[in-house]
Interface confidence: medium
């Protein structure tokens, strides 16, 4: 599908940029440039510049872009559940008598014969079949955390539902913090959601594995349907290798701009409006490192080599198994933008404008 | 970078299945498939099955894989904003006795004049600025719904923190429903998350433009830092061209399947282990929709040609603006598999094996 | 109450630590402080210890002091003191619940420490 | 940097009279400042917090004002025991800081 050529870095930057002229105008839905006949001298006002700078404020709890998947990802997960303690265990004694919660409680000494090391753990779901709901429930799931207290984790909207339904929580960081030093007996709560000003919510959602009066006595259990642990982890034997072998790179500016490397990462490419693009129009700001990304991604014939140093190259090389891999890019940001349309400032944002990370695809 | 050739649909098959073949041993870190010699007869054992069709379920609130990005999300959106309601307006009187919660109010006719139809807005944001926080502090935010009653949204843990911070909360839902069908003034409250067994709570967070007392009573507010709803919208004038414009393609299963698209799209391909790989030790599942990317993603020179028709294609053909742009996987998916290594079974998650769609990038 | 210890004289470089004994309060409710004042001169904020355990300190400590605490201890090291350091230290615990702010309101005396070669 | 600049240095008031000593932020810092009282060869004292909440067991002679970046601290009907060195803490930021504290005014009675 493509053949090699010595690459012309000038032409790709030139396209890039070439590239970008277009991309800006069609995302503005703009046929050419504006006129800036009629904007007011001097600088922007303040409240334009205020909101421009809103856009590029980072809040504290917003998602930054997706970072690049570690190795340990891109490797196989066994998968291995750990059901809920029977409710005979003692330790559902000192929680009977609540009508707003019920209560589950794993056994720590079966989840480290999962998985002996806390660094193995990929990813753990607590799964619970919820039986069918009448009204709509918010309820809130927490975590056994010293002796009779309980660390809020997260919440959940249940919407009606004529039919069972399982409900996933991702409760990946406590089954790590229970393996590193748990006690013998770990457990999750799941409560009704209750405000400050309105408090006698019951829980109305029946779980699974619970009788209706939601005291922890369990009832019965329709085969392996009671509440459980969906351990995803390395395998032991396979964890050395983690340690030992060259982590996969994150091809992104850390790495690729202070190295030499030959094969796909991404390349430094800073923008300035008015010398590359010849452009006055845009007011902030005066220019942008859009980035790109460039170099090969070898295809790895795998039929006559399936030795472990070849397939070791496909965590790098091609870890989509693509027929024709391709360096692309991974990690995009925003850029927010101050132009005028007459005499009217503007703020936009145009999404996905600043290369972070490449890979191969 | 690249030349065109007439495409042999067989070699890339062919290079893709092969390429499957190494991807899956280097998942597992296999250097060649394991032996069958001690798998016991008879089918998979049924806790083994149950844990395989764990992996496989959907359950209720996972998040699906990222959706391709809709043909409005590559268009710029203007960003404006809008501040909070100051409080010596007389909606602010019915809300003044809680030590638990603070509430912030907002003219809805101001977010109409910023963002004139509901389908317009992209995304609003809730901006505060937390003062400096001396403990962990658990707050819920609530949408004022009807009279006197509010909808709970979402919930962040702050951290104690040793210098302000702006908080973001995503709104959009609740400010497009505002601007389908609001009153003339919607609000906001921020509540300390009170559990069913302790509501004694205080909110202990200082937002800024608040008094101390935390009753809602403005205080002098420091420049424009007093809470704001950010919007970012698709300007008026450019909205016709969305329900005009022929809408920017999903290049998924759905669309490709059905078609004879002949540029970039996501091509079907069904790998039966036994048949295509001479495999017979991957005892569950039999085969899988493992699909690729193909078809080319014409790079457009906008230097002599900018005008509407050209720089529409960019959002189809080149929306990230590459000097080469290439046709790769957007959403992937995970494949669960059951195999033996000895006398054992194993379920295993392998990552990103189905193709589900494809973009040019 | 809170009171200071462990002050006395010391020559250049040599680490020391002070340490603050609370009662009748628990540490994992209230913040804490450390305040010096070198003889005739104002008060000059070192850092603070939060509730839950996050310290932060003034911008030219620079690591030559650190607070830690236990349950009923605040301490504060003084890395590789200098004459500079020669002061009264004073450690200081938060008004609580009473405000969101971090204000001082109940004090130790205070313990003096002298850098002399 | 939240810098806090205190002035006059130092005053002198008659018994009875008001005597005002002013806070000023180098940055708004909203209302989280507190006033501090400090005799010789005493620990500082608490007076006000959040710019002009009266702590337990001060007078109410004692009143503090302002927010942003302007705060002052009003001592009327002044008393021989008022004779101390005043401080003003700011609590908006810990982040490059040098010195929560202002510098001090010191208070003489004539």
């Known amino acids: 599908l493509s053949t090699c050529k010595t690459i012309d870095m000038e032409l790709v930057k030139r396209k890039r940029i070439e590239a970008i002229r277009g991309q800006i105008l069609s995302k503005l839905r703009l046929a050419s440039p504006p006129s800036q006949g009629e904007v007011p001298p001097g600088p922007l006002p303040e409240a334009v510049l205020a909101l421009y700078n809103s856009t590029r404020d980072r809040v504290a709890g917003e998602s930054a872009e997706p970072e690049p998947e570690p190795e340990a990802d891109y490797y196989a997960k066994e998968v291995t559940r750990v059901l809920m303690v029977e409710t005979h265990n003692e330790i559902y004694d000192k929680f009977k008598q609540s009508t707003h919660s019920i209560y589950m409680f794993f056994n720590t000494s079966e989840l480290r014969e999962a998985v002996p090391e806390p660094v193995l753990l990929s990813r753990a779901e607590l799964r619970l079949l919820r039986l069918k709901l009448k009204v709509e429930q918010h309820v809130e799931l927490y975590q056994k955390y010293s002796n009779n207290s309980w660390r809020y984790l997260s919440n959940r909207l249940l919407a009606p539902s004529d039919s069972p339904e399982w409900l996933s929580f991702d409760v990946t960081g406590v089954v790590r913090q229970w393996l590193s030093r748990g006690g013998e007996i770990e457990g999750f709560r799941l409560s009704a959601h209750c405000s400050c000003d309105s408090r006698d919510n019951t829980l109305q959602v029946d779980i699974n594995g619970f009788t209706t009066g939601r005291r922890g006595d369990l009832a019965t259990i329709h085969g392996m349907n009671r509440p459980f642990l969906l351990l995803m982890a390395t395998p032991l034997e396979r964890a050395q290798h983690l340690q030992s072998s060259r982590h996969r790179r994150a091809l992104d500016t850390n790495y690729c701009f202070s190295s030499t490397e030959k094969n796909c990462c991404v390349r430094q490419l800073y923008i300035d409006f008015r010398k590359d693009l010849g452009w006055k129009w845009i007011h902030e700001p005066k220019g942008y490192h859009a980035n790109f990304c460039l170099g090969p991604c070898p295809y790895i014939w795998s039929l006559d080599t399936q030795y472990s140093k070849v397939l070791a190259l496909y965590n790098q090389h091609n870890p989509g198994a693509s027929a024709a891999p391709c360096c692309v890019p991974q990690a995009l940001e925003p850029l927010p933008i101050v132009y005028y349309v007459g005499r009217k400032p503007k703020v936009e944002q145009l999404s996905n404008m600043i290369v972070r990370s490449c890979k191969c695809s | 970078l690249s030349t065109c050739k007439t495409i042999d649909m067989e070699l890339v098959k062919r290079k893709r299945i092969e390429a499957i073949r190494g991807q899956i041993l280097s998942k597992l870190r296999l250097a060649s498939p394991p032996s069958q010699g001690e798998v016991p007869p008879g089918p998979l054992p049924e806790a083994v099955l149950a844990l395989y069709n764990s992996t496989r379920d959907r359950v209720a609130g996972e998040s699906a894989e990222p959706e391709p990005e809709p043909e409005a999300d590559y268009y710029a959106k203007e960003v404006t904003r809008v501040l909070m309601v100051e409080t010596h307006n007389e909606i602010y009187d019915k809300f003044k006795q809680s030590t638990h919660s603070i509430y912030m109010f907002f003219n809805t006719s101001e977010l109409r004049e910023a963002v004139p139809e509901p389908v317009l807005l992209s995304r609003a944001e809730l901006r505060l600025l937390r003062l400096k926080l001396k403990v962990e502090q658990h707050v819920e935010l609530y949408q004022k719904y009807s009279n006197n009653s509010w909808r709970y949204l979402s919930n962040r843990l702050l951290a104690p923190s040793d210098s302000p911070e702006w908080l973001s909360f995503d709104v959009t839902g609740v400010v497009r429903q505002w601007l389908s069908r609001g009153g003339e003034i919607e609000g906001f409250r921020l509540s300390a998350h009170c559990s069913c067994d302790s509501r004694d709570n205080t909110l202990q967070v200082d937002i800024n433009g608040f008094t101390t007392g935390r009753r809602g009573d403005l205080a002098t507010i420091h420049g424009m830092n007093r809470p704001f709803l950010l919007l970012m919208a698709t300007p008026l004038e450019r909205a016709q061209h969305l329900q005009s414009s022929r809408h920017r393609r999903a290049l998924d299963t759905n669309y490709c399947f059905s078609s004879t698209e002949k540029n970039c799209c996501v091509r079907q391909l069904y790998i039966d282990f036994r048949k295509d790989l001479g495999w017979k030790w991957i005892h569950e599942p039999k085969g899988y929709h493992a699909n690729f990317c193909l078809g080319p993603c014409p790079y457009i020179w906008s230097l002599d040609t900018q005008y509407s028709k050209v720089l529409a294609l960019y959002n189809q053909h080149n929306p990230g603006a590459s000097a080469a742009p290439c046709c790769v996987p957007q959403a992937l998916e995970p494949l669960p598999i059951v195999y033996y290594v000895g006398r054992k079974p194993k379920v295993e998650q392998l990552s990103n094996m189905i193709v589900r769609s494809c973009k040019c990038s | 109450s809170v009171e200071e210890s462990g002050g006395r004289l010391v020559t250049p470089g040599t680490p020391l630590t002070l340490t603050c004994t609370v009662s009748?309060?628990?540490?994992?409710?209230?913040?804490m402080t450390w305040v010096r004042q070198a003889p005739g001169k104002g008060l000059e904020w070192i850092g603070v210890?939060?509730?839950?355990?996050n310290t932060y300190y003034a911008n030219w400590v620079n690591g030559r002091f650190t607070i830690s605490k236990t349950s009923t201890t605040v301490d504060l090291k003084i890395t590789s003191p200098t004459t500079e350091d020669t002061a009264t230290y004073f450690c200081?615990?938060?008004?609580?619940?009473?405000?969101?702010?971090?204000?001082?309101?109940?004090w130790g005396p205070g313990t003096l420490v002298t850098v002399s070669s | 940097a939240y810098d806090m600049t205190q002035t006059p240095a130092s005053v002198e008031v008659a018994v009875g009279g008001t005597v005002t000593i002013k806070c000023q932020a180098s940055?708004?810092?909203?209302?989280?400042l507190a006033w501090y009282q400090q005799k010789p060869g005493q620990p500082p004292k608490l007076l006000i917090y959040?710019?002009?909440t009266l702590a337990s067991g001060v007078s109410s002679r004692f009143k503090g004002s302002g927010s942003g970046t302007e705060f002052t601290l009003t001592i009327s009907g002044v008393e021989c025991a008022d004779a101390a060195t005043y401080y003003c803490?700011?609590?908006?930021?810990?982040?490059?800081?040098?010195?929560?504290f202002g510098g001090g005014t010191k208070v003489e009675i004539k």
């Open positions: 200081a615990r938060d008004v609580g619940s009473s405000s969101s702010g971090v204000y001082f309101n109940i």
């Open positions: 009748g309060f628990s540490l994992s409710n209230y913040a």
């Open positions: 210890i939060y509730a839950g355990g």
């Open positions: 940055q708004s810092i909203g209302s989280r």
């Open positions: 959040d710019a002009s």
């Open positions: 803490q700011q609590d908006y930021s810990y982040r490059h800081v040098d010195n929560i």
